[in-house]
Interface confidence: low
């Protein structure tokens, strides 16, 4: 009679993480008598996966009933596959012996490859805010995928970025992989509403890539521009001096009025108006009683924005020449600023 052969018909099996892997194995003869064992890997360090004779293998089930006398199908199923299960599995026939069974013949092996989905990409930006024209770094990380091949792209508002470097670790063979990418983004004044998107495409995602996002509103600081103007209001001897703070972000802003270098009033931006680009405008005003002054008054609007060094704009109020033209400033009524005379 022809000598028993152990046949593993599948050279490789590809399984998605979480699914069940079927590893096929058949023998060509019932002789010699003895059990089948499944191992992952070969040589002395091989790992026992299933032993027909004894042991507890909760994740492994047999395809056929191995207790039947004429059974020659020793295929197994391994449930809830993870990337850690990847490797080459060998179906090995043992011959009954005393005191121990003796290895008789091994199958050629079946390579189990596990496809595991990457985790949702996590995008993180710089720790500190930066101003327009500066280049900032964003990182994107995704983990736990297999096989190693993966594509990562960066977008800013739907436009693909090119300034990035991507690394997939580890470099050598592994049960699963991680990807880390750093992108450089140049900020513009219009970026308050902008988004940076990291997009990861992998064979397990079936053409539906995973995306991680970062809002540039958390990264950008748009410094304000200041304009100090005066207009006559109510009576000829009163002048409305306004400080218009334009196009700033974030909202955190403190304004101080100085009269000839002395602090007159400090207030925090509250009722701001929002521009289409996401930046804010705000206005503060003073009512100056010109008749109470003999000398010119130097009014300074000083703004501290988002903890940055103060910027200021000054205006020289000419006491000698009262402005004649009439004007109104309805925007000032919404600021919540206090009326104030200078004495």
């Amino acid at each position: 009679e022809e000598e028993l052969q152990v046949i593993q018909p599948d050279k490789s099996v590809l399984v998605a993480a979480g699914e069940t892997a079927t590893l096929r194995c058949t023998a060509t003869s019932l002789i010699p008598v003895g059990p089948i064992q499944w191992f992952r890997g070969a040589g002395p360090g091989r790992e026992l996966i299933y032993n027909q004779k004894e042991g507890h293998f909760p994740r492994v089930t047999t395809v056929s009933d191995l207790t039947k006398r004429n059974n020659m199908d020793f295929s197994i199923r391994i449930g809830n596959i993870t990337p850690a299960d990847a490797g080459t599995y060998y179906c090995v026939k043992f011959r009954k012996g005393s005191p121990d069974d003796v290895e008789f013949k091994s199958g050629a092996g079946t390579e189990l490859s596990v496809r595991a989905k990457p985790s949702a990409p996590v995008v993180s930006g710089p720790a500190a805010r930066a101003t327009p024209q500066h280049t900032v770094s964003f990182t994107c990380e995704s983990h736990g995928f297999s096989p190693r091949d993966i594509t990562l792209k960066w977008f800013k508002n739907g436009n693909e970025l090119s300034d990035f470097q991507t690394n997939v670790d580890p470099v050598g063979e592994s049960v699963s992989y991680s990807i880390h990418s750093t992108a450089k983004v140049v900020l513009t004044r219009e970026d308050v509403h902008s988004q940076v998107i990291c997009e990861v495409a992998h064979v397990t995602l079936q053409g539906d890539p995973l995306r991680g996002t970062a809002n540039l509103s958390e990264t950008i600081r748009v410094p304000p521009t200041l304009e100090v103007t005066q207009q006559p209001v109510r009576a000829e001897n009163q002048v409305n001096v306004t400080c218009q703070v334009r196009k700033f972000y974030p909202q955190r802003l403190q304004l101080t009025w100085l009269e000839n270098g002395n602090v007159s009033r400090t207030e925090t931006a509250s009722t701001v108006t929002e521009n289409k680009d996401g930046t804010y405008n705000w206005m503060s005003w003073l009512l100056v009683n010109v008749s109470a002054h003999r000398d010119d008054v130097k009014l300074t609007c000083q703004v501290e924005h988002d903890g940055q060094p103060a910027v200021s704009k000054s205006h020289d109020l000419k006491v000698s020449a009262h402005p004649k033209e009439q004007g109104s400033n309805t925007a000032a009524e919404n600021t919540g600023s206090n009326e104030r005379n200078i004495y």
């Epitope: 280049t135 693909e160 090119s162 300034d163 470097q165 991507t166 450089k184």
Partner: antibody, heavy 122, light 107 residues
């Protein structure tokens, strides 16, 4: 006038080291990414390495990774390429080039230096 | 790595001819493509960037087109100074890669 002037090329034995320099003038060196591109005799262009404006990012071609190091000294307006463990296949004219976009990555290069020849031979 | 394939590898043409060089990327690169001209013994010179933008100082007879994977450099009326080798270059991924070059020779 914008100028890039490479120096440091020459004949070197396999396994030895060489450092190339590129002196920049006529533009704000510290505002541009810089790169090295090489061209083997009679062959096409091969990108070697690039460095960001502030030196925070450096990228290398696989063929030179671990052997070559790109660096810059913005105070001296100079770009460097330290080449270690040189091989015969590193023989080429080495060009230094400027990333075209201010504060951006080196998407396209302009201008280029005149090049310096590195010959690796025993 | 993204492979850049240029065709033809060489072309013979006469002064006044219209010359077209193509460049194909192994995967989509949007408009992140540049074209360079190189004359013997000289450094490359940027002609076109972002697939179709003409670099300052480059004659308008040079034009670029394409997006995604297929790109074209066209010289509308070849001049004596245009005989050179032309390279395309992708800039969307590292490593930055160049095409193999197209040599434009005098017929």
């Amino acid at each position: 006038e914008v100028q890039l002037l490479e120096s440091g090329g020459g004949v070197v034995q396999p396994g030895r080291s060489l450092r190339l320099s590129c002196a920049a003038s006529g533009f704000t060196f510290s505002s541009y990414a810089m790169g090295w591109v090489r061209q083997a005799p009679g062959k096409g262009l091969e990108w070697v390495a690039v460095i960001w404006v502030d030196g925070s990012l450096k990228y290398y071609a696989d063929s030179v990774k671990g052997r070559f190091t790109i660096s810059r000294d913005n105070s001296k307006n100079t770009l460097y390429l330290q080449m270690n463990s040189l091989r015969a296949e590193d023989t080429a004219v080495y060009y230094c080039a400027t990333g075209r976009e201010t504060y951006s990555g080196p998407n396209w290069f302009d201008p280029w230096g005149q090049g310096t020849l590195v010959t690796v031979s025993s | 790595d993204i492979q850049m394939t240029q065709s033809p590898s060489s072309v013979s043409a006469s002064v006044g001819d219209r010359v077209t060089i193509t460049c194909r990327a192994s995967q989509g690169i949007s408009s992140w493509l540049a074209w360079y001209q190189q004359k013997p013994g000289k450094a490359p010179k940027l002609l076109i960037y972002a697939a179709s933008s003409l670099q300052s100082g480059v004659p308008s007879r040079f034009s670029g087109s394409g997006s995604g994977t297929d790109f074209t450099l066209t010289i509308s009326s070849l001049q004596p100074e245009d005989f050179a080798t032309y390279y395309c270059q992708q800039a969307i991924y590292f490593p930055i890669t160049f095409g193999g070059g197209t040599k434009v020779e005098i017929k």
